[in-house]
């Protein structure tokens, strides 16, 4: 129980097209040191949705202040959802490494389904 766990509490989230989707993720520990990334899909073909360390992700906002000391909440919100955003999203903890960070642990995944925009 002491080792870091990646918690993605929602197994499934359904959002209407045009709305924002909140994907929740938290860590149970600050150790090991290293960034959090969000991906859509798993394996070699997964798509990077958000990288805590670097990059520009205009549709993604973090739900809590990630720079805040002792922050364990790495939930994100994705704006203006379209059917193309459907899929399973994984919150992944990386361990700081040299030269590259190493994947440490992944959440169980949250399946995002997109409903037609209400008329």
């Amino acid at each position: 129980e002491d080792e870091l766990q990646v918690i993605q509490p929602e197994k499934s989230v359904s959002v209407a097209a045009g709305e924002s989707a909140t994907l929740r993720c938290a860590m149970t520990s600050l150790i090991p040191v290293g960034p959090i990334m969000w991906f859509r899909g798993a394996g070699a073909g997964r798509e990077l949705i958000y990288n805590q360390k670097e990059g520009h992700f205009p549709r993604v906002t973090t739900v809590s202040e990630l720079t805040k000391r002792n922050n364990l909440d790495f939930s994100i919100s994705i704006s203006n959802i379209t059917p193309a955003d459907a899929g399973t999203y994984y919150c992944v903890k990386f361990r700081k490494g040299s030269p590259d960070d190493v994947e440490f642990k992944s959440g169980a995944g949250t399946e995002l389904s997109v409903r037609a925009k209400p008329s």
Epitope: P9, S12, D73, S75, G109, E111
Partner: antibody, heavy 120, light 112 residues
């Protein structure tokens, strides 16, 4: 051995509020999901909402939205459920239950229940 | 929200008989990770509910092996191979795939 111990029975007047506590002992608190489930006399089980203390914010069933507030105090490993604008139909046994937040293990630990009676 | 429908409403059995309880969901409870997010609970008279089966078919700790869960997607079954007097109570299914978490209406098991 994890245990959930709930506060005692309450008798309330219509229109008032009730706050029920659920203290966890013997295990990790912040990363588990605490749900509140109620059971009216002779009726089935009804999920009211739940909280994972590590996130701080709660999820609520739409039926109770605006009338129920679920909170958690990590320092005392205690969860709370407050229900306002009480009516006679809120007379029920209120349970807290613990589950791992991924849902893999079901609600494996339940409190003993708190009877709330709403009567004028 | 996901609606769970249980049948029958009441099951009256003699000790040693086999019990079959059904739970049907209004939408699939099968996640892309391969798990079915359906649990079974037993509430004995005057007691808090207790977990019997999680993820559709996994027995919770301490649950006798006469209880078994099966099914996938929208149709689930709880079987009690040989009913005993201590098995009386109301059995509920629950879906944990998405919030709001919902329960079935329950099946009451009684001994003749």
């Amino acid at each position: 051995q994890v245990q959930l111990v709930q506060s005692g029975a309450e008798v309330k007047k219509p229109g008032s509020s009730v706050k029920v506590s659920c203290k966890a002992s013997g295990g990790t608190f912040s990363s588990y999901a605490i749900s509140w489930v109620r059971q009216a006399p002779g009726q089935g089980l009804e999920w009211m909402g739940g909280i994972i203390p590590i996130f701080g914010t709660a999820n609520y069933a739409q039926k109770f939205q605006g009338r129920v507030t679920i909170t958690a105090d990590e320092s005392t490993s205690t969860a709370y459920m407050e229900l306002s604008s009480l009516r006679s139909e809120d007379t029920a046994v209120y349970y807290c239950a613990r589950a791992k937040p991924r849902g893999d293990y079901g609600m494996d630990v339940w409190g003993q229940g708190t009877t709330v009676t709403v009567s004028s | 929200e996901i609606v769970l429908t249980q049948s029958p409403a009441t099951l009256s059995l003699s000790p040693g008989e086999r019990a079959t309880l059904s739970c049907r969901s209004s939408q699939s409870l099968l996640h892309s990770n391969g798990y079915n997010y359906l649990d079974w609970y037993l509430q004995k008279p005057g007691q808090s509910p207790q977990l019997l089966i999680y993820l559709g078919s996994n027995r919770a700790s301490g649950v006798p092996d006469r209880f078994s869960g099966s099914g996938s997607g929208t149709d689930f079954t709880l079987k009690i191979s040989r009913v005993e007097a201590e098995d009386v109570g109301v059995y509920y299914c629950l879906q944990a795939l998405q919030t709001p978490i919902t329960f079935g209406g329950g099946t009451k098991v009684e001994i003749k």
